[in-house]
């Protein structure tokens, strides 16, 4: 059985979101793929691959780059220089025609907030990491931090408690949260 869960990614302005969507090779290797944002009930296609898909031929639309790896059954999505208004729900889809698209797994809830200084992270850091918890703790929770922290095991009802110096976040009914560090 496949779990369909919404995944939450938190970033600061100026950083880069990098995600992947996997698909059944035998079914969709040669199909066009698209990256869409849900706006109300209507999805808006932001970028789509060429047809037929070819390895290492990235498609760039503004700040979005799609790279399909049909040999590997993966679509790579990169959104650079994230802005607060980019926040929202995103999906990878197999693009057949505008009115018919097959949604790939796990919609992504992107939350972009202003940096503490109100400026984007440095160019070196802004393209970096989706952080995960250390291997000694409950890594299924997602985040990896560069600053000291504790991560408590998620209780059965799926409330995640992530503690970082000077802050505590309680997340209820969110399967995972993946956070990048705040760059001051």
């Amino acid at each position: 059985t496949t779990e369909l869960t919404e995944e939450k990614y938190e970033y600061k302005e100026g950083q880069t979101l990098e995600v992947k969507c996997d698909y059944a090779l035998e079914k969709y290797a040669n199909s066009r793929k698209a990256w869409q944002k849900m706006e109300g009930k209507m999805p808006k296609i932001l970028a789509k691959t060429e047809r037929p898909s070819e390895n290492s031929h990235p498609v760039q639309v503004g700040r979005i780059t799609l790279e399909d790896y049909p040999d590997h059954g993966l679509l790579q999505v990169r959104m650079t220089n994230l802005q607060v208004e980019d926040s929202g729900l995103y999906q990878c889809v197999i693009y057949q025609h505008p009115k018919e698209s097959h949604v790939l797994f796990n919609p992504i809830c992107l939350v972009v907030t202003k940096g503490s200084s109100g400026t984007p992270g440095s160019s070196e850091n802004s393209t970096q990491n989706v952080y995960r918890t250390p291997s000694t703790t409950a890594k299924a929770l997602g985040p990896r931090y560069t600053s000291p922290r504790t991560v408590t095991q998620a209780p059965p009802e799926s409330t995640v408690v992530v503690s970082t110096p000077g802050s505590e976040i309680n997340l209820t009914n969110v399967t995972d949260i993946i956070r990048v560090p705040v760059f001051n």
Epitope: T2, E3, E7, E18, V19, K20, C21, D22, Y23, A24, L25, S56, E67, Y69, D71, H72, G73, L74, Q76, V77, R78, F105, N106, I108, E124, T127, Q128, N129, V130, R132, S135, A138, K139, A140, G142, T175, D176, I178
Partner: antibody, heavy 122, light 107 residues
Amino acid sequence: QVQLVQSGAEVKKPGASVKVSCKASGYTFTRYDINWVRQATGQGLEWMGWLNPNSGNTGQTQKFRGRVTMTRNTSINTAYMELSSLRSEDTAVYYCARGGYTSAWRWYFDLWGRGTLVTVSS
Amino acid sequence: DIQMTQSPSSLSASVGDRVTITCQASQDINNHLNWYQQKPGKAPKLLIYDVSNLETGVPSSFSGSGCGTDFTFTISSLQPEDIATYFCQQYDKLPLTFGGGTKVEIE
């Protein structure tokens, strides 16, 4: 305890198949990719491919396409890698390794099995 | 495929020495570079991810730097327990590729 436990060493004849298992424990199996990496004696590391335990989707490098099959059984948190049409140059240690979160473009392997030695000899 | 060229392939140094290993990618890999340590008969162990981030529990004597195509891994003060082979790995593009490894020995 967070770990990946692999099946034991195998000796196979050329042309045969081998199936290596990798049992995950201590974390949510379906949330992280499982990758397979092999290493011939005294050689470097070679990535073979990946498995998303949640969707069951897989991908392999071109070198192994058609010869390798990656599967999983989520009820027992176990991933499998089957390599067919074995030849002597497939003699190697085969590792399973946990990759990044299934939806993240984060391919670092922070948890490894101990490896399974597969010897192909007539 | 992206080629990862590691050098030197082996080195010998004294306890307390500073040891540097380089890894060169055949194209820009956008800081998608990791470093692993492998001791004889053992599985590799992740030390550094994304160029310079230390994996939890890894001593601060290990560090990484670089950008674009050229990356460096440093052991600030070599200890007997650091005897191992070190590998770099890129993940900017598929297939994932590793460097050939650098075997570090004590003089």
